[in-house]
């Protein structure tokens, strides 16, 4: 299996909400001896490998933001801790999983990584990750809503309809 990142770059104004998304692709074994562990973290573009380093997102570690289940089951993070930090990670039945960040600030800018670990019981673990950049902008140059750039090409897409501005 692989992990696809539909968008490689998200450009958002301060105060906006955004949902970063990854998608599990390829054959997914739904047998009893396979489970999936999914999580999110911040990282840096390392010289050797992107997403190697695991940094917290708004002080929450990858341990705090994980989802643990079989195959394409739906799941959500433990709400309380994440929601207190304006975060929520979720997974649906179709292999999509995401992290939603509310009320963005300039400090949220950086590289974000989704990680999937396929656990084949009594055999091995297979890890794959996806990376995407979040740029939070302020001032007159900032877009009015989040603009996303697909991974395959640099055609931008406005995602106003899906992500409503945070009201204070």
């Amino acid at each position: 299996f692989k992990v696809a990142t539909p968008y490689s770059l998200y450009v958002c104004p301060e105060g906006q909400n955004v949902t970063l998304t990854c998608r599990l692709l390829g054959p997914v074994d739904k047998g009893h001896d396979v489970t999936f562990y999914k999580t999110w973290y911040r990282s840096s573009r390392g010289e050797v490998q992107t997403c190697s380093e695991r940094r917290p997102i708004r002080n929450l570690t990858f341990q705090d933001l994980h989802l643990h289940h079989g195959g394409h089951q739906a799941a959500n993070t433990s709400h309380d801790l994440a929601q207190r930090h304006g975060l929520e990670s979720a997974s649906d039945h179709h292999g999509n999983f995401s992290i939603t960040m509310r009320n963005l600030t300039l400090l949220d800018s950086g590289l974000y990584c989704c990680l999937v670990v396929e656990i084949r019981h009594h055999h091995s673990e297979h890890r794959v990750h996806g990376a995407m950049e979040l740029q939070v902008q302020t001032g007159k140059d900032a877009p009015s809503n989040c603009v996303v750039y697909p991974s395959s090409s640099q055609e931008s897409e406005n995602i106003t309809a899906h992500h409503h501005h945070h009201h204070h």
Epitope: Y37, S78, I119, H121, R127
Partner: antibody
């Protein structure tokens, strides 16, 4: 604070049994895989057994398979290791440690000493 | 079972010197390797994860590299508190295995 505390170690005769416990606090125990790792006096570390966050699957080292049983009670934030048919070579400090898929042992207890001797 | 061989068994150095520890795997473990530090009477502490990344709170004098079968842990300038035993551990396959350890002692 975030910690693991082992108990239940002691002196036991060859062929005897012992049950070790590990009490977790300061983190969401039910989120984590848990392992037992041992260290014979003056020797290196040996992974013994691991249990997933939900209690299944379970893994054992060949050296203890059929003799040791790992279990957990998420409601009590506790991990256990039932050790039967103990041998002199099982003498060691036994540590419990937390783990996650694609991760490592990032929190360890202080250990409990098991001595198997006649 | 993947066997991890650490060398040297003992490293005798003075504070301020550079320490280089090696860990070799009997087959590839990709980058799924960690380093731990253990002081007498204490539990091990995670230093490095995924071959080259410092765990939370680990000083910058600790660095590591490698992938596949050959890995290195480097302590750029030894502090008195760094004299301890260091273990590598792989999680590429079951069972989880550790190296036999390298003792870094004061010369």
């Amino acid at each position: 604070q975030v910690q693991l505390v082992e108990s239940g170690g002691g002196l036991v005769k060859p062929g005897g049994s012992l049950r070790l416990s590990c009490a977790a606090s300061g983190f969401t125990f039910s989120d984590y895989y848990m392992s037992w790792i041992r260290q014979a006096p003056g020797k290196g570390l040996e992974w013994v057994s691991e249990i997933s966050n939900s209690g299944s699957p379970i893994y054992y080292a060949d050296s203890v398979k059929g003799r040791f049983t790992i279990s957990r009670d998420n409601a009590k934030n506790s991990l256990y290791l039932q050790m039967n048919s103990l041998r002199a070579e099982d003498t060691a400090v036994y540590y419990c440690a937390r783990d996650l898929p694609g991760w490592y042992f990032d929190l360890w207890g202080r250990g409990t000493l098991v001595t198997v001797s006649s | 079972e993947i066997v991890l061989t650490q060398s040297p068994a003992t490293l005798s150095l003075s504070p301020g010197e550079r320490a280089t520890l090696s860990c070799r795997a009997s087959q590839s473990v990709s980058s799924y390797l960690a380093w731990y530090q253990q002081k007498p009477g204490q539990a091990p502490r995670l230093l490095i994860y995924d071959a080259s990344n410092r765990a939370t709170g680990i000083p910058a004098r600790f660095s590591a590299s490698g992938s596949g079968t050959d890995f290195t842990l480097t302590i750029s300038s030894l502090e008195p508190e760094d004299f301890a035993v260091y273990y590598c551990q792989q999680r590429n396959n079951w069972p989880r295995t550790f190296g036999q350890g390298t003792k870094v002692e004061i010369k």
